[in-house]
């Protein structure tokens, strides 16, 4: 995930309890990774700015048949005000940059941990 133009508040940011559970699920994915996550599937990178939860979901929802990220997809759907379906693309996607799901998850996790530490959740 790339952050263009510096840090922006990703509002409305999830309640801290929900953000904590998303972080824990991403930790679980990264720790339990033995084979390549989602068979090495590639997803669009996103900007970590306002609206990033929907953008992250729009990117990950295009990965099908990967049970490891299903819970993450469900959690992200609770952080996005609109219905997201495969093939949707947000302006937050870095459309010329694709990365592996494993890297996407790691980058998202690092950013969410930063948000959580800084108390930017409500």
């Amino acid at each position: 995930l790339t952050c263009l133009g510096g840090f922006a508040s990703p509002g409305p940011v999830p309640p801290s309890t929900a953000l904590r559970e998303l972080i824990e699920e991403l930790v679980n994915i990264t720790q339990n990774q033995k084979a390549p996550l989602c068979n090495g599937s590639m997803v669009w990178s996103i900007n970590l700015t306002a609206g990033m939860y929907c953008a992250a979901l729009e990117s990950l929802i295009n990965v099908s048949g990967c049970s490891a990220i299903e819970k993450t997809q469900r959690m992200l759907s609770g952080f996005c005000p609109h219905k997201v379906s495969a093939g949707q693309f947000s302006s937050l996607h870095v459309r010329d940059t694709k990365i592996e799901v494993a890297q996407f998850v790691k980058d998202l996790l690092l950013h969410l941990k930063k948000l959580f530490r800084e108390g930017q959740f409500n």
Epitope: S16, T17, E24, M75, G78
Partner: antibody, heavy 121, light 113 residues
Framework: QIQLQQSGAELARPGASVKLSCKAS????????ISWVKQRDGQGLEWIGE????????DYNEKFKGKATLTADKSSSTAYMELRSLTSEDSAVYFC??????????????WGQGTTLTVSS | DIMMSQSPSSLAVSVGEKVSMTCKSS????????????LAWYQQKPGQSPKMLIY???TRETGVPDRFTGSGSGTDFTLTISSVMAEDLAVYYC?????????FGDGTKLEVK
Amino acid sequence: QIQLQQSGAELARPGASVKLSCKASGYTFTSYGISWVKQRDGQGLEWIGEIYPRSGNTDYNEKFKGKATLTADKSSSTAYMELRSLTSEDSAVYFCSSFTTLVPTDYFDYWGQGTTLTVSS
Amino acid sequence: DIMMSQSPSSLAVSVGEKVSMTCKSSQSLLYSSNQKNYLAWYQQKPGQSPKMLIYWASTRETGVPDRFTGSGSGTDFTLTISSVMAEDLAVYYCHQYFTYPRTFGDGTKLEVK
């Protein structure tokens, strides 16, 4: 079904430490957080903190930092809370609960039967 | 910390009566992205553990009788029992799970005449 079995009543001296346990069954222990809640003499409920057993990550109520330490043993599906430097103010019933606030599909919160701690000289 | 204020602190009603109790939070518990209120209601009978009745402010837990109804949004919430039964004798607590520390109201004690 989901069950949380807490350890029996404890009697402790002021200044001592005590470790309460909460054994989970009926679900995957590492999938959900465990919260601890204090209730004094039939009074209100006070959230102490929570632990995520898979990672060991914890979140505490500032009021209980330095008083309570939460741990979890994945192999036995048991969560623990150690209370130290006990005073009469720590005499209470302590509950554990297993929870998730995952949206939009899930919410649950299952409670243990409580452990009564009495601190007395 | 989010403060949770419940009223009344106690009330006595006859079997069959309708009763309502309120809970006010010091800040909004509504998350605009999913339009969910991070509020639950618990029932604690004498000598027992708390039992969740309602979550997301208005969703009834499985197995909870439909005489229990949760309503409200933002900072103002209500638990209504449409027709009180003797077994409803308990203390009722509201709980916010929006942010840390999670907090509870002081409870409303329901006594059955």
